[in-house]
Amino acid sequence: HQDKVPCKMVDKKVSCQVLGLLQVPSVLPPDTETLDLSGNQLRSILASPLGFYTALRHLDLSTNEISFLQPGAFQALTHLEHLSLAHNRLAMATALSAGGLGPLPRVTSLDLSGNSLYSGLLERLLGEAPSLHTLSLAENSLTRLTRHTFRDMPALEQLDLHSNVLMDIEDGAFEGLPRLTHLNLSRNSLTCISDFSLQQLRVLDLSCNSIEAFQTASQPQAEFQLTWLDLRENKLLHFPDLAALPRLIYLNLSNNLIRLPTGPPQDSKGIHAPSEGWSALPLSAPSGNASGRPLSQLLNLDLSYNEIELIPDSFLEHLTSLCFLNLSRNCLRTFEARRLGSLPCLMLLDLSHNALETLELGARALGSLRTLLLQGNALRDLPPYTFANLASLQRLNLQGNRVSPCGGPDEPGPSGCVAFSGITSLRSLSLVDNEIELLRAGAFLHTPLTELDLSSNPGLEVATGALGGLEASLEVLALQGNGLMVLQVDLPCFICLKRLNLAENRLSHLPAWTQAVSLEVLDLRNNSFSLLPGSAMGGLETSLRRLYLQGNPLSCCGNGWLAAQLHQGRVDVDATQDLICRFSSQEEVSLSHVRPEDCEKGGLKNINL
């Protein structure tokens, strides 16, 4: 088969991807070091011509139809370091005639994913691989791992077994892998991890199984190295016992069935009966433990999509390094962090989509908190300085609650209102859909917000001076869907405002922007505007990029400024083809089709054109 095909060759690298090849080409340079034959139709791998390429270091045979490996096919490739046979048909009996892959003395990475391999077969396929560092067996049909599965792989560090059907891992299955640091067992059928004992492991992915319990081996002097543990999308009923994992930095427990206990534990030894719900909150560490404080190094904890109704004080106590805590989509009715120094490093707290009615944040707790997500709860009467106490808070989302903002210091407002003035760190605030009836004067005084969303508060009354103090900072303002008929906001004073959303109100007039400002996007959809006079809009011409106007009863005449934008202006007006206007006769036409003479007919001069 001395047949040249249009491969790409660079130095000693050759790519023959997706060329419909039925055989390994024999006319490639003999000193080729990298050969990519992926995406072809190879069915068998023979020692000849593959053996001609003795300099090969990288060989990619993925996504072919390989079902036959000639014994010794790779024997001559003494420099081979990376071999991919992913997505082939190695499970067919002919692949294993004698000795499977054979010895791979220098191969450091081997990809056998997507081959429908089953357990007994794998042991026959894998030969001696003393240098193997990375092995992928993902997307196969493995049901169990025995102590014979991974033999002769003393250097293996990374093992990927995701998307198999593993139900059983025999004791000692990984014993022959003393250097294993990364293990991916996600998307299998595991139900229990009862004796986790891989001390050298750093990263363990157990997501998307059916695990009901996770228990480390009770070895008092054990020095577990695990830093990253993913248990999301399992069936855990309790917070797992992680006291033996002092180095844990990342822990994902989302999408389980976890409930935290409501009362104190019955004893204080650290390991508790699952029936008590304490299977074990990380309360105390085994005596020989390096750190003595379980989870004290944890940076990221995700408990979203569980069934947690309450967070016990003791649970948060040891999380002294935690930066990111996600408790969204649980059943929390209350959340408290009152103690001095509680969660001192926490930067993001997501409590969204719970059933929170009360929130108690101590004056000096959560000192590093920058982002607080509370959307989709039932918060109503909060202590007035709930958020003002958070010294580092930058972003606060309260969408879908029932929070009523207080006024400024001179006009405090009714009981149960929450102060949003004087929060000097706060930059972004969402009060969407909070049934706010009145926004009082000075509500955001000395709070230099750049983004404020007050949308979906139908009937909202914005008092004069309600946005006072934001003139020099506000960049994004949304007041969509509030039924506003007049705007008690002197918009031209907001010199930094870039995006303004006034859609779905009943506005018919805008203040005059006579001098240049920063506004880039103006959304006026579904209001009552008939005219946008040039006298009011002129100051926007230098900055405005997008103007949304659909759903307004625009007049065909007198809208010269708008017509000019449609024809040659810099402003991109949405849906220009469909922007409908009305003549006094109620005749509707596309605004872009209106000519000056159409307005002169009835003595209606188009004053701006």
């Epitope: 088969h1 001395q2 047949d3 040249k4 095909v5 249009p6 491969c7 790409k8 060759m9 660079v10 130095d11 690298k13 790519s15 997706v18 060329l19 419909g20 090849l21 039925l22 006319v27 990298t34």
Partner: antibody, heavy 120, light 111 residues
Framework: EVKLVESGGGSVKPGGSLKLSCAAS????????MSWVRQTPEKRLEWVAT????????YYPDSVKGRLTISRDNAKNTLYLQMSSLRSEDTAMYYC?????????????WGQGTSVTVSS | DIVLTQSPASLAVSLGQRATISCRAS??????????MHWYQQIPGQPPKVLIY???NLESGIPARFSGSGSRTDFTLTINPVEAGDVATYYC?????????FGGGTKLEIK
């Protein structure tokens, strides 16, 4: 001196057939990947087909697959393009071209072309 | 398919001046650190001829006045200085991904 000479062009009605030939000389024909490229009346270049040096493998863009067939006779140093079910958009100047020695789709020598017109 | 967009569609340059033609790919044409972008010249009445292969390599027999540069998606053919015999249409071609595609061409004229 490398020489490629196309022949077989002409006028044909839509749905008709035509067979183009390309006689090669001045190089070891059987060592090279060969291609056909066409140039539309608007002067756009379009790759039409490629064949491996031994003739075992052929490659086409989706727009001509099933209608155009490339083949070669290494004994006669000749490349062919059988064209059937022709359409008006197949009207073009058809060039025979030699691929680079390493087998890439880059074409280092081209013939003078043969014109094909498909019109009713 | 990878789309190649050449600009300008035509340009007029004075003799002895520099001509620059651009070719932009809809996605990267790099493999193994090399760019599989090539440039052809088609003098009126003649077939195309390779000038530059793999972005910057001069085909043998082509004068050094022609040079190519670029990587990933943005490529340039430069002719400096332009001579009368350079009046032609110039095409870029990518062979990184099947099917190989050509740009729409740039017509060079003398001012």
């Amino acid at each position: 001196e490398v020489k490629l000479v196309e022949s077989g062009g002409g006028s044909v009605k839509p749905g008709g057939s035509l067979k183009l030939s390309c006689a090669a000389s001045g190089f070891t024909f059987s060592n090279y990947v060969m291609s056909w490229v066409r140039q539309t009346p608007e002067k756009r270049l379009e790759w039409v087909a490629t064949i491996s040096s031994g003739g075992s493998y052929t490659y086409y863009p989706d727009s001509v697959k099933g209608r155009l067939t490339i083949s070669r006779d290494n004994a006669k140093n000749t490349l062919y393009l059988q064209m059937s079910s022709l359409r008006s958009e197949d009207t073009a100047m058809y060039y025979c071209a030699r691929g680079y020695d390493n087998g890439d789709y880059v074409m280092d020598y081209w013939g003078q072309g043969t014109s094909v017109t498909v019109s009713s | 398919d990878i789309v190649l967009t050449q600009s300008p569609a035509s340009l007029a340059v004075s003799l002895g001046q520099r001509a620059t033609i651009s070719c932009r790919a809809s996605e990267s044409v790099d493999t193994y650190g090399n760019s599989f972008m090539h440039w052809y010249q088609q003098i009126p009445g003649q077939p195309p001829k390779v000038l530059i292969y793999r972005a910057s390599n001069l085909e043998s027999g082509i004068p050094a006045r022609f040079s190519g540069s670029g990587s990933r998606t943005d490529f340039t053919l430069t002719i400096n200085p332009v001579e009368a015999g350079d009046v032609a249409t110039y095409y870029c071609q990518q062979t990184n991904e099947h099917p190989p595609t050509f740009g729409g061409g740039t017509k060079l004229e003398i001012k």
